[in-house]
């Protein structure tokens, strides 16, 4: 988590700040959405439990050519301790359920806001 905040960061970013920034980026995506997000691409739904940052990244990394979520993908990689590449599949995915990226982002945003309110940053 200490690496979050981008290359220009003068120093380590507190976990709460990193989470707030991720939330603000997701808010940005949902508020600026005009056409269907990522052309209505579908991604695997995930269980919003421990390890969900990696699971979320594993889902979203399979969406290519969607500039709207590129920053989110980068930010999520800072929360995931291992390298994630397209095609990886986590046990946290709900295998039989695919949802639109817009719904995925909305669900993730809701959960992260509650984690922030409850002080759960890891």
């Amino acid at each position: 988590l200490t690496c979050l905040g981008g290359f220009a960061s003068p120093g380590p970013v507190p976990p709460s700040t990193a989470l707030r920034e991720l939330i603000e980026e997701l808010v940005n995506i949902t508020q600026n959405q005009k056409a269907p997000l990522c052309n209505g691409s579908m991604v695997w739904s995930i269980n919003l439990t421990a390890g969900m940052y990696c699971a979320a990244l594993e889902s979203l990394i399979n969406v290519s050519g969607c500039s709207a979520i590129e920053k989110t993908q980068r930010m999520l990689s800072g929360f995931c301790p291992h390298k994630v590449s397209a095609g990886q599949f986590s046990s946290l995915h709900v295998r039989d359920t695919k949802i639109e990226v817009a719904q995925f982002v909305k669900d993730l945003l809701l959960h992260l806001k509650k984690l922030f309110r409850e002080g759960q940053f890891n």
Epitope: S16, L19, R20, K114, E118, F121
Partner: antibody
């Protein structure tokens, strides 16, 4: 329009049970937290506990843990307060309230309250 | 548990008066996310409470500018700059930073 409506209050004997309901409209309870707050006659406000209906994460004031149980039914968009082993000192108006939906910083909507009277 | 101590418990004032209510927490109510979830609610007899101030000093939408909040750490203040007839009510501070959340005992503002 956002609205919270409590029901289920009334007269109950000491040792008895009561289940209060909080019916929400104008928003989805899964998107926020629902809290229960009570107020004894002529006294101040007292936070009882809260539920996150999205995952049934529930927190109580320890003084109510064990006797009181908070739950939610997302299909009915309602929250509940089950009160057991009631005592005279539980006599109060019981309110439900929601956390605002942006960052959950405060209670922006409250119900009208339902009066619970514990007496023999 | 965090105790929220309000003072005074009641006060008498006239329309136009400046009124100050204080609230002291038994320990810091800065949340681990950096926010201080200190709120002020107004309640009139037979009615549900209404939010006035959140996160110490932010006025809720629709709340008149005569209401203001300040403070940090453990000491907080609600100020009514010029008391109006509709302001006669009971005021509660509330901390939503640490569970169990807690209210202050209330301050009843009465007509002198």
């Amino acid at each position: 329009e956002v609205q919270l409506v409590e029901s289920g209050g009334g007269l109950v004997q000491p040792g008895g049970s009561l289940r209060l309901s909080c019916a929400a409209s104008g928003f989805n309870i899964k998107d926020t937290y629902i809290h229960w707050v009570r107020q004894a006659p002529g006294k101040g406000l007292e936070w009882v506990g809260r539920i996150d209906p999205a995952n049934d994460n529930i927190k109580y004031d320890p003084k109510f843990q064990g006797r009181f149980t908070i739950s939610a039914d997302n299909a009915k968009n309602s929250a509940y307060l089950q009160m057991n082993s009631l005592r005279a000192e539980d006599t109060a108006v019981y309110y439900c309230a929601r956390s605002e939906e942006n960052w959950y910083d405060f209670f922006d909507y409250w119900g009208q309250g339902t009066l619970v009277t514990v007496s023999s | 548990d965090i105790q929220m101590t309000q003072s005074p418990s009641s006060l008498s004032a006239s329309v136009g008066d400046r009124v100050t209510i204080t609230c002291r927490s038994s320990q810091s109510i800065v949340h681990s996310n950096g926010n201080t979830y200190l709120e002020w609610y107004q309640q009139k007899p037979g009615k549900a409470p209404k939010l006035l101030i959140y996160k110490v000093s932010n006025r809720f939408s629709g709340v008149p500018s005569r209401f203001s909040g300040s403070g940090s750490g453990t000491d907080f203040t609600l100020t009514i700059s010029s008391l109006q007839p509709e302001d006669f009510a009971t005021y509660y501070c509330f901390q939503g930073s640490h569970i169990p959340y807690t209210f202050g005992g209330g301050t009843k503002v009465e007509i002198k």
